[in-house]
């Protein structure tokens, strides 16, 4: 009598997640009587996938009509495939008994699942950094298979090179994750800049997934300060202007000090945006010169985005004869920034 053969014609089958997988198996003979079972994996830890004899396997169906005894096709179809279904499947013939006796196994069919990566999520630094500093952005994508994947970083369309990328796990797995970190050098012009993490995978059919982050969330552009005096008015009042320019974000508090005493505090709000995304703000202070015997030291103090205050001071000279206007009153800019202000073009 011819020896029973269990034939699994495909060594491997690749299926997209969510689709159905057909695993083919035929036997050369129906003798002896006994069930066919499908297992994932081999050895004592193998997992029963389908038993034509009995059991409830909601995702698995026999491809051919199992009520036809002369049917030697024991192929199965597994629906709604997920990465967790990956593995090698064996079609095994048993002889009926107590227990059933394993007679012959097919060579096995390796099922690989093509699973799309999740949409890349890009996260930036927890705190803002100023121009000329380097910040790190992280991109993560999960759940893809097979392991081969390409990740690229772009800033305003230009590919970044200071990148470190890892795919986990290193060994075989049902699905994989990628994590990449890009280091980006900030400039004052980066308020409107964007970094893009682009992921390409076989499941995406040439249409990569992208995750983005705006550098506006990561950058702080400190303001330039300039204090100037307009000409003396007829009513002995001097108009002093504090110009705060090229800053980002908008969160800014300006305080006027007269001889060290707080005169007025203002908060920036609803400012128009410059083309480069930064903001400008001008504050005026009217100083009544006739109310002062001595020179007045005016200080424009700016606190930007929770950072230490920046001061710019200005002295208004008060003459012994205040009624004589014009040349008798001098203005002197004695202010200095108490921290470095980075220059840049707007």
């Amino acid at each position: 009598e011819e020896e029973l053969q269990v034939i699994q014609p495909e060594k491997s089958v690749s299926v997209a997640a969510g689709d159905s997988a057909t695993l083919n198996c035929t036997v050369s003979s129906l003798i002896p009587v006994g069930p066919i079972q499908w297992f994932r994996g081999a050895g004592p830890g193998r997992e029963l996938i389908y038993n034509l004899k009995e059991g409830h396997f909601p995702r698995v169906t026999a491809v051919s009509d199992p009520t036809k005894r002369n049917n030697m096709d024991f192929s199965i179809r597994i629906s709604n495939i997920t990465p967790a279904d990956a593995g090698t499947y064996y079609c095994v013939k048993f002889r009926k008994g107590s227990p059933d006796v394993e007679l012959k196994s097919g060579a096995g069919t390796e099922l690989s699942v093509r699973a799309k990566p999740s949409a890349p999520v890009v996260s930036g630094p927890a705190v803002r950094a100023t121009a000329e500093h380097t910040v790190s952005f992280t991109c993560e994508s999960h759940g893809f298979s097979p392991r081969d994947i390409t990740l690229k970083w772009f800033k305003n369309g230009n590919e970044l090179s200071d990148v470190q990328t890892n795919v986990d796990p290193a060994g075989k797995s049902v699905s994989y994750s990628i994590r990449s970190t890009a280091r980006v050098l900030l400039t004052r012009r980066d308020v409107h800049s964007q970094v893009i993490c682009e992921v390409a995978h076989v499941t995406l059919q040439g249409d990569p997934l992208r995750g983005t982050a705006n550098l506006s969330e990561a950058i702080r552009v400190p303001p330039f300060l300039e204090v100037t005096q307009q000409s003396m008015r007829a009513d002995n009042q001097v108009n002093v202007t504090c110009q705060v320019t090229k800053f980002y974000p908008q969160r800014l508090q300006l305080t006027w000090l007269e001889n060290g005493n707080v005169s007025r505090t203002e908060m920036a709000s609803a400012l128009p945006e410059n083309k480069d995304g930064t903001y400008n703000w001008t504050s005026w202070l009217l100083v009544n010169v006739s109310a002062h015997r001595d020179d007045v030291k005016l200080t424009c103090q700016v606190e930007h985005d929770g950072q230490p205050a920046v001061n710019k001071s200005f002295s208004v000279k008060v003459s012994a004869h205040p009624k004589e206007q014009g040349s008798n009153t001098a203005a002197e800019n004695t202010g200095t920034n108490e921290r470095n202000i980075y220059g840049g073009s707007g």
Partner: antibody, heavy 118, light 107 residues
């Protein structure tokens, strides 16, 4: 429609012979293990004999050497040749199809009565 | 030979009742156990195979369970047409053997 129809039953004297037939329709009889089961009047069911798809045959102890199971593929029919009949063989004889993969009985004929009496 | 013992031999019940019939094998038969229903003057009807699988067309009020040596047939809500004799059968090895039957009668 899948169907089994038995014939050939009747009254026979002890020591006599009888040949039961089972005509199958709606399926290919040679693709299934086929069985004969009997039921004596007022008694329970008793498996008698089987023939496998490879032609292998099996019998219950009390009929071994007296009964012969066979089939004729061309006629899609199953037979039970009964010799040296005894009163204890009196029963309704059912032709039964063995089910898929494991030979569980799934289709029964309506039965044919065999009476062994002098 | 493997002996099959059914209990009880007879059982009286009312329409709507839930009844359980047990079958014990003299040795391990895996789950190669079938249940049949027979009405007077009729051929047996196959209900259950491999201990718990319902044959096509059999209503779900019939259920089977067990493995090894101890098995049960449960009818969840008796209807008039369910009053009959029920047989279990092992078919793990020849000679196939039946239980002696359980006659289910109307109370």
């Amino acid at each position: 429609e899948v169907q089994l129809v038995e014939s050939g039953g009747g009254l026979v004297q002890p020591g006599g012979s009888l040949r039961l037939s089972c005509a199958a329709s709606g399926f290919t009889l040679s693709s299934y293990d086929m069985h004969w089961v009997r039921q004596a009047p007022g008694k329970g069911l008793e498996w008698v004999s089987a023939i496998g798809t490879a032609g292998d045959t099996y019998y219950t102890g009390s009929v071994k050497g007296r009964f012969t199971i066979s089939r004729e593929n061309a006629k899609n029919s199953l037979y039970l040749q009964m010799n040296s009949l005894r009163a204890a063989d009196t029963a309704v004889y059912y032709c039964v199809r063995g089910g898929v993969w494991d030979d569980a009985f799934d289709i029964w004929g309506q039965g044919t009565m065999v009476t062994v009496s002098s | 030979d493997i002996q099959m013992t059914q209990s009880p031999s007879s059982l009286s019940a009312s329409v709507g009742d839930r009844v359980t019939i047990t079958c014990r094998a003299s040795q391990d038969i895996n789950n190669y156990l079938a249940w049949f229903q027979q009405k007077p003057g009729k051929a047996p009807k196959s209900l259950i195979y491999t201990a718990s699988s319902l044959h096509s067309g059999v209503p779900s009020k019939f259920s089977g369970s067990g493995s090894g040596t101890d098995f049960t047939l449960t009818i969840s809500s008796l209807q008039p047409e369910d009053f009959a004799t029920y047989y279990c059968q092992q078919y793990v090895s020849y000679p196939y053997t039946f239980g002696q039957g359980t006659k289910l009668e109307i109370k």
